[in-house]
């Protein structure tokens, strides 16, 4: 088989026939050096998954439940292309599983026990697997058989396709539990009708069900959604209040050597020639000899799944949790109101050492998880491998786009009521050597730059955002002659000045000596012309405050700030000479962990915060000899956010807009992946 062949896996005679037609029609429109199709027939989707894992086939299209199976070891497949529905302008690749209730019914998600439930059908995604999977650990024991546990949890149900003889309570609201539209409460519309008629208290459906059944907004306003954080929201806020976000239909391939670019090239060309309304003789999204052969008949086209996205991220934490609960059937010994340990994400081994010491001193309240980059940490928090970390505002933005929420903010000023008063922010500045007297904000082109890291606030988003407005392109590596911006591509001129050895060169963690605020300032001291840091960086590393050999003899008076009006000022005049105000660093977590992270961190700062006076023998949470490990070293306390509890509210409109403008210059693979899930 030539290298550019994609071996498509078919699961029936009809699919194999369509696959052969697909192969032949592609041959007729694609040059001989382009991608081609070969067909492999297997007895089932699971056999296809195994065949792809064994390199006997390359691709198959699966629904969400099977994407989960495909991801599990030893298969290790990943999503590579998604089908979309709706229009090209507003492509829908996901649907949302929701719990709909009547507005005046007054109960929350954690009060469903004893209520009456309406399901689309037994074993169906939005109507059964997701809600029952998420409720699994609240079901009465024994949880097997599952139908019996569900019957004992709700006071009555309609679960079409259930066995009404063995589990009569599951058919109490729809006698017989008929498994077709002959049962008025079957399917999405049926489950909603079950709620609408007053038979049930809650209907488990998908987000579009309400809109399809109630054209009138006034009618829709009689209903609400139950959210997982035990609040309610209007039915049109399903993106912020759902049980799970579920991909509709996805092409999967091997994680390693999976031909994902070739598969995309093939399908992209296929949709150009044989997509919706493209050709009479062969249609990709049509199945004359059956239904949904190879692809869904209702699909409108394909979108490439961002390469950073593995199956866990693609399926989402809630969906994976629900399906894992159902499949594995494991729950904590006895559900308690006590918080589980918070798994803190530590970057590289320096942070891991500090985290380990924290863990030892916390006596079981803190556990540690390691990752090499901030984005890897965010991904681990998203999928539940970790729970929390403190982030610079630039990463709070990415984390927010990925569904995480800020929970506490670092405060840097001593005040009587530190924990109750989140600060307005710190100043992002541009520092130069006093001796380079001709250097101004207006003549930085061709100079050597030092940045805390790509994607961070003071070191990147603010200065590069301002620069972008001036130069109108993203080629910052051409604007500066060279620099150190950890996280840049290794062959970029913005890695040239970095000092890390070997693989650590230009890495966005403490293994790169020029990483972070202190690192960027060191870069200026030793090699650079300008450093983009925070207003406290120079005083914190001069006048003997940093004992490291490179810093111990530095004098604050030898440095100046660049002002946006083209003038320069002494370092202490940052309030009148800065690039912008930056939001303080903040702790982020998943929504489901918010309350516990808040509670445990507040306990931990009372034990190990800035009230500890002697850090030589006691563990100090906010100290690491100017290295800003886990938290900034100048943190005085972690403060409540009050109502600034979403990333947009926390960062503020101005900053969100600034970072949004820089998005076109973004090299963040995680941001790309998360905006695929939520554009």
């Amino acid at each position: 088989v030539p290298d550019k062949t994609v071996r498509w896996c078919a699961v029936s005679e009809h699919e194999a026939t369509k696959c052969q037609s697909f192969r032949d029609h592609m041959k007729s429109v694609i040059p001989s050096d382009g991608p081609s199709v070969a067909c492999v027939k297997k007895a089932s989707y699971l056999d296809c998954i195994r065949a792809i894992a064994a390199n006997e086939a390359d691709a198959v299209t699966l629904d969400a439940g099977l994407v989960y199976d495909a991801y599990l070891a030893p298969n290790n497949l990943k999503p590579v292309v998604a089908e979309f529905y709706g229009s090209k302008e507003d492509p829908q690749t996901f649907y949302y599983a929701v719990a709909v209730v009547k507005k005046d019914s007054g109960f929350q998600m954690n009060q469903l026990r004893g209520k009456k439930s309406c399901h689309t059908g037994l074993g169906r995604s939005a109507g059964w697997n997701i809600p029952i999977g998420l409720l699994y650990c609240d079901l009465p024991e024994p949880r097997k058989p599952l139908e019996k546990a569900v019957a004992n949890f709700f006071s009555g149900s309609c679960a079409p396709c259930a066995d009404g003889t063995d589990f009569p309570q599951l058919c109490q609201l729809c006698p017989g539990c008929g498994c077709s539209t002959l049962n008025q409460y079957f399917g999405y519309s049926g489950a909603f009708k079950c709620l609408k008629d007053g038979a049930g208290d809650v209907a488990f459906v998908k987000h579009s069900t309400i809109f399809e059944n109630l054209a009138n907004k006034a009618d829709r306003d009689q209903y609400e959604l139950l959210c997982l954080d035990n609040t309610r929201k209007p039915v049109d806020e399903y993106k912020d209040c759902h049980l799970a976000q579920v991909p509709s239909h996805t092409v999967v391939a091997r994680s390693m050597g999976g031909k994902e670019d070739l598969i995309w090239e093939l399908l992209n060309q296929a949709q150009e020639h044989f997509g919706k309304d493209k050709s009479k003789e062969f249609q990709l999204f049509s199945s004359p000899h059956g239904k949904d052969l190879l692809f869904k008949d209702s699909a409108h086209g394909f979108l490439k799944v961002p390469p950073r996205m593995d199956a866990k991220m693609y399926l989402g934490y809630e969906y994976v949790t629900a399906i894992r609960n159902l499949r594995e059937g494991t729950c904590p010994e006895a559900p308690t109101d006590e918080c589980k340990p918070v798994k803190w994400c530590a970057l590289s081994h320096h942070e891991r050492l500090k985290c380990d010491e924290w863990s030892v001193n916390s006596v079981g309240k803190i556990e540690c998880v390691s990752a090499e980059t901030t984005e890897d940490c965010i991904a681990k928090i998203m999928n539940g491998e970790a729970d929390a970390m403190s982030l610079d505002g630039g990463f709070v933005y990415i984390a927010g786009k990925c569904g995480l929420v800020p929970v506490l903010a670092e405060n840097y000023n001593k005040s009587d009521n530190c924990e109750d008063t989140p600060e307005a922010g710190y100043f992002a500045i541009a520092v130069v050597k006093k001796s380079a007297s001709d250097l101004t904000w207006d003549n930085l082109k061709g100079k050597k730059s030092c940045h805390t890291a790509v994607g961070r606030t003071a070191g990147w988003n603010i200065p590069m955002g301002l620069l972008y407005n001036k130069i109108n392109h993203c080629r910052f590596d051409e604007f500066f002659s060279e620099g150190c911006a950890p996280g840049s591509k290794k062959d970029s001129s913005l890695c040239k000045l970095c000092m890390g050895s070997g693989l650590n060169l230009c890495e966005p963690n403490n293994k790169e000596g020029y990483y972070g605020y202190t690192g960027a300032f060191r870069c200026l001291v030793e090699k650079g012309d300008v450093a983009f840091v925070k207003h406290q960086t120079v005083p914190q590393n001069t006048g003997g405050k940093n004992p490291d050999p490179w810093a111990k003899n530095l004098n604050e008076k030898d440095y100046e700030l660049l002002c946006l009006d083209g003038t320069r000022k002494p370092v202490e005049e940052y309030a009148n000479c800065h690039l912008a105000r930056a939001p303080n660093h903040a702790v982020v977590t998943r929504k489901d962990k918010e309350a516990c992270v808040h509670k445990i961190l507040r306990q931990q700062q009372h034990l190990f915060g800035s009230n500890v006076t002697d850090c030589s023998g006691n563990f100090c949470l906010f100290r690491s000899e100017t290295k800003d490990l886990l938290f900034r070293d100048d943190t005085v306390c972690l403060a409540k956010l009050h109502d600034r509890n979403t990333y947009e509210k926390y960062l503020g409109e101005e900053y969100v807009k600034a970072v949004g403008n820089l998005r076109k210059c973004s090299t963040s693979s995680l941001l790309e992946a998360c905006t695929f899930r939520r554009p």
Partner: nanobody
Framework: QVQLVESGGGLVQSGGSLRLSCAAS????????MAWYRQAPGQQRELVAG???????KYADSVKGRFTISRDNAKNTLYLQMNSLKPEDTAVYYC???????????WGQGTQVTVSS
Amino acid sequence: QVQLVESGGGLVQSGGSLRLSCAASGTIFAINTMAWYRQAPGQQRELVAGITRGGSTKYADSVKGRFTISRDNAKNTLYLQMNSLKPEDTAVYYCTDYSRGYYQDYWGQGTQVTVSS
């Protein structure tokens, strides 16, 4: 200069026991949190057990119930009693005193523990 010298490693059969010691000098031993780490070939260094100045302990899940960390402040010595050893416990074991700073890549020479099946 802080000096940490680990000893007590060796070759032992699966199911056997060893007691590691770490002698510290150049530090006010009694006031610091101490820990044992281990590093198997090709693996990251990982926390095995830690003990605070007040004697509170923490263990990695993989060694809970088998290993015991203790300290003798008078002798400036940290111990790790390892029982029911398994082949997967094979590694170089290091002790550390966190007061030296998290960013200093200074470790003692460690002591090799090899568990044969």
